[in-house]
Amino acid sequence: MGARRLRVRSQRSRDSSVPTQCNQTECFDPLVRNCVSCELFHTPDTGHTSSLEPGTALQPQEGS
């Protein structure tokens, strides 16, 4: 697909379903096939709200 060789810590087969280990503040992004900065999910105590702080998210309606 034209992507250059990835850094060693995140190299994986394009078809592999198991990413290699990322740093603690990172997670594996299958789209770019690399470790990237990752934000935490936040679960509000109350139900759906549209006044969350930036970078927060609701849990899915049908559950994880």
Partner: antibody, heavy 125, light 107 residues
Framework: EVQLVESGGGLVQPGGSLRLSCAAS????????IHWVRQAPGKGLEWVAW????????DYADSVKGRFTISADTSKNTAYLQMNSLRAEDTAVYYC??????????????????WGQGTLVTVSS | DIQMTQSPSSLSASVGDRVTITCRAS??????VAWYQQKPGKAPKLLIY???FLYSGVPSRFSGSGSGTDFTLTISSLQPEDFATYYC?????????FGQGTKVEIK
């Protein structure tokens, strides 16, 4: 506040070149992937290219491969799209966007959360 | 490449209506689907990511569901500011691809 500002669009003749810039503020581009997405007049969204600025890894849509080059300067917190051999069908508004990732069992659940205002590229003689 | 097929391409609805837009992927994309809203002359805005997660600041009348190949965006009670074009996008694999868009117009 997270912000992306594109610049560099304009009118260019077929076969010509343009360099688009995407200046980011409020976050560090090396932490995310940066994408270019375009929209031809009256048409839908088409992804063009992405880069992970932390290591320069890139990928391109087949329609621009070999003609466009995406790059980033982390010291300037800016991404670029060098467009060569431009064609009439490249006429579009070009947006840069940040892909945000949320951690789901150490795998990204992500999308393009912040977009620039867009810059118009017109390829015409 | 993974094709994303949206339906309908356009629809007419009234304020207060429940609106459902569907998106079908040409192959399994797990839950790696986002939904965006775009108004004329403006950049797209993220509504839903990972198929069913409501993005920060988005009103709760928007919801998303689905996994695998079939996905749905629902607006529970259409508001005047919701008249726009909506796009789905898969980010399961490169190239990330968008649906062709659904224009929601005033009836």
């Amino acid at each position: 506040e997270v912000q992306l500002v594109e610049s560099g669009g304009g009118l260019v003749q077929p076969g010509g070149s343009l360099r688009l810039s995407c200046a980011a503020s409020g976050f560090t581009i090396s932490s995310n992937s940066i994408h270019w997405v375009r929209q031809a007049p009256g048409k839908g969204l088409e992804w063009v290219a992405w880069i992970t600025p932390s290591d320069g890894n890139t990928d391109y849509a087949d329609s621009v491969k070999g003609r466009f080059t995406i790059s980033a300067d982390t010291s300037k917190n800016t991404a670029y799209l060098q467009m060569n051999s431009l064609r009439a069908e490249d006429t579009a508004v070009y947006y840069c966007a940040r892909r945000v990732c949320y951690d789901r069992a150490r795998v990204c659940a992500g999308a393009m959360d912040y977009w620039g205002q867009g810059t118009l590229v017109t390829v015409s003689s | 490449d993974i094709q994303m097929t949206q339906s309908p391409s356009s629809l007419s609805a009234s304020v207060g209506d429940r609106v459902t837009i569907t998106c079908r992927a040409s192959q399994d994309v797990s839950t790696a689907v986002a939904w965006y809203q775009q108004k004329p002359g403006k950049a797209p805005k993220l509504l839903i990511y990972s198929a069913s997660f409501l993005y920060s600041g988005v009103p709760s009348r928007f919801s998303g569901s689905g996994s695998g190949t079939d996905f749905t965006l629902t607006i529970s009670s259409l508001q005047p500011e919701d008249f726009a074009t909506y796009y789905c996008q898969q980010s399961y694999s490169t190239p990330p691809t968008f649906g062709q868009g659904t224009k929601v117009e005033i009836k």
